[in-house]
Interface confidence: medium
């Protein structure tokens, strides 16, 4: 999916008002310096591509993020403010519902969510030069 035509300011507002708090809740008890940010993004569409991938694609050691509250809200924001996104994702979502996994918080998941926090922060500061 091409995130170029999303309403970035509305997605930013949704992040600031709800998604950010859920990410913090998920990471509670973890030191902010515990994980190094290894995933980066260069502009807002790229950031959303990376955010979608880390949030919804199962990875080795972390298969359970999609049912977390921050993920559900991310999905909502993308569905509402990215034209056509819900149509491209609905089949994948229905397939996911058929094979619901038990939510397990692993160290790998914590690391992945730490990366997500960095991507969201970058999304909110699109004019900063890439380090």
């Amino acid at each position: 999916y091409d995130f170029t035509n999303c309403d970035f300011e509305k997605i930013k507002a949704a992040y600031l008002s709800t998604i950010s708090k859920d990410l913090i809740t998920y990471m509670s008890g973890t030191k902010s310096t515990e994980f190094n940010n290894t995933v980066s993004c260069s502009n807002r569409p790229h950031c959303l591509t990376e955010i979608q991938s880390l949030t919804f694609n199962p990875t080795a050691g972390c298969a359970s993020l999609a049912k977390e509250m921050f993920a559900m809200k991310t999905k909502a924001a993308l569905a509402i403010w990215c034209p056509g996104y819900s149509e491209t994702q609905i089949n994948a979502t229905q397939a996911m519902k058929k094979r619901r996994k038990r939510k397990v918080t692993t160290n790998k998941c914590l690391e992945q969510v730490s990366q997500l926090q960095g991507l969201w922060r970058r999304f909110n500061r699109p004019l900063l030069k890439q380090q």
């Epitope: 509250m69 809200k73 999905k75 909502a76 569905a79 509402i80 994702q89 609905i90 979502t93």
Partner: nanobody
């Protein structure tokens, strides 16, 4: 099949109040997010407010402090309490659930005029 039925609209004077209802069927209501959208003549449909299964809410800047979204999971119904209505709130109001952004109901017309 997902079905959404909106009600509660009408004509109200500026400063007045209305409470919209959205009766939903075809899924487990409490497992999803739900949003109220509106579409004014000649404008795009926009999100007014959303509520999530953890009870947290989202409001568009234009309605913050005036509108309140809520849900009664036992009745599979969501509500939008609209206070201090303004003429610019005039629109057809729709509810939507999770991915089902193509399953729009008929909507309910809210007209704010003196």
């Amino acid at each position: 099949e997902v079905q959404l039925v909106e009600s509660g609209g009408g004509l109200v004077q500026p400063g007045g109040s209305l409470r919209l209802s959205c009766a939903a069927s075809g899924f487990i209501f409490s497992s999803y997010w739900m949003g109220w959208f509106r579409q004014a003549p000649g404008k795009e449909r926009e999100l007014v407010s959303a509520i999530f299964s953890d009870g947290s809410t989202y409001y568009a800047d234009s309605v913050k402090g005036r509108f309140t979204i809520s849900a009664d999971n036992s009745k599979n119904t969501a509500y939008l309490q609209m206070n201090s209505l303004k003429p610019e709130d005039t629109a057809v109001y729709y509810c939507a659930i999770d991915w089902y952004l193509n399953s729009w109901g008929q909507g309910t017309l809210v007209t704010v005029s003196s």
